[in-house]
């Protein structure tokens, strides 16, 4: 059954808490992703910039998260018209905005 | 191109140890992950393990005590051992590519022959 | 881990005709609302080759005719109609949990 809006993005946020807390050499190996307009679609968007990181398994659960909250497919490569215009960040630093954001949805309940 | 390729010694004693090494060109081992997957003659296809782009490690359960899987990233080289092997062991040896999220094993190498036999 | 069973061991379809091969997991191989199954065609000395991944999405440069579909434990490749180059073993493989898993094949024979 689907994960109620609530739940997902408790799940999300609490994920991203635990890639943070725990992180020790460069996460991902320094990988840069598109930086994304987190102001709508936020679970697609994310996934659309994060699916382009390969054989990174701290972020694995992430992606699949993203991807079961996203209701359209999503592939690698996909341009993203969510995407801030040619402005790559390190990975670390996606996630750390990207649940800033998060939280601040989750503060405001807007789950969906 | 994105090309794996695995090497191997062939033939092996009873008991031995075996070495494996995957070469692979046109992308690189630091942002992919490479598996470990073998064949018996006539059988059927057995994952042994993986590495992640990030170093992580993931075995196989069954062989776990017995399997250790690093790699020269630098170098483009992932390497398979195996320890006190058995004619049972014998098989071809393939090393597999991940590709982008969901981590279907999307490239392979044609593999290599080892025969475990005194 | 996960245990994969595949049936029929072997099938003989005719040209032009369908072929089903089914897969059972042990346990749901079902991720927030995805199925992390994918299959994989290999023919007589060569590599396995994959076909679908996530259940039911066609590999880039595989023919329409093959298709995946199922969800949790139980899970269907389709090919029709069938082609003699489809003569091959395929197998269904699991990435839900750290340690994947395989199953044991299905053998196709074109009459």
């Known amino acids: 059954s689907p994960v109620p809006p609530s739940t997902a993005l408790k799940e999300l946020i609490e994920e991203l808490v635990n890639i943070t807390q725990n992180q020790k050499a460069p996460l991902c190996n320094g990988s840069m992703v598109w930086s994304i307009n987190l102001t709508a679609g936020v679970y697609c968007a994310a996934l659309e910039s994060l699916i382009n990181v390969s054989g990174c398994s701290a972020i694995e659960k992430t992606q699949r998260m993203l991807n079961g909250f996203c209701p359209h497919k999503v592939s690698a490569g996909q341009f993203s018209s969510l995407r801030v215009r040619d402005t790559k960040i390190e990975v670390a630093q996606f996630v750390k905005d990207l649940l800033v954001h998060l939280k601040k949805l989750f503060r405001e309940g807007q789950f969906n | 191109e994105v090309q794996l390729k695995e090497s191997g010694p062939g033939l092996v004693a009873p008991g031995g140890s075996l070495s494996i090494t995957c070469t692979v060109s046109?992308?690189?081992?630091?942002?992919?992950?490479i598996n470990w997957v073998r064949q018996p003659p006539g059988k059927g296809l057995e994952w042994l393990g993986m590495?992640?782009?990030?170093?992580?490690?993931d075995y196989a359960d069954a062989l776990k005590s017995r399997l250790s899987i690093s790699k020269d990233s630098s170098k483009s080289q992932v390497f398979l051992e195996m320890t006190s092997l058995r004619t049972d062991d014998t098989a071809t040896y393939y090393c597999?590519?991940?590709?982008?999220?969901?981590?279907?094993?999307?490239?392979w190498g044609q593999g290599t022959s080892v025969t475990v036999s005194s | 881990d996960i245990v994969l069973t595949q049936s029929p061991a072997s099938l003989a379809v005719s040209l032009g005709q369908r072929a089903t091969i089914s897969c059972r997991a042990s346990?749901?191989?079902?991720?927030?609302?995805?199925?992390?199954m994918h299959w994989y065609q290999q023919k007589a000395g060569q590599p396995p080759k994959l076909l679908i991944y996530?259940?039911?999405n066609l590999e880039s440069g595989v023919p329409a005719r093959f298709s995946g579909s199922g969800s949790r434990t139980d899970f269907t490749l389709t090919i029709d109609p069938v082609q003699a180059e489809d003569a091959a073993t395929y197998y269904c493989?699991?990435?839900?949990?750290?340690?994947?898993?395989f199953g044991g094949g299905t053998k196709l024979e074109i009459k």
């Open positions: 597999a590519r991940d590709g982008y999220f969901p981590y279907a094993m999307d490239f």
């Open positions: 046109g992308f690189s081992l630091t942002d992919s992950s």
């Open positions: 590495i992640w782009g990030d170093g992580r490690i």
């Open positions: 346990e749901s191989v079902d991720s927030y609302g995805q199925s992390y």
């Open positions: 996530l259940a039911s």
């Open positions: 493989q699991q990435n839900a949990e750290d340690s994947r898993t």
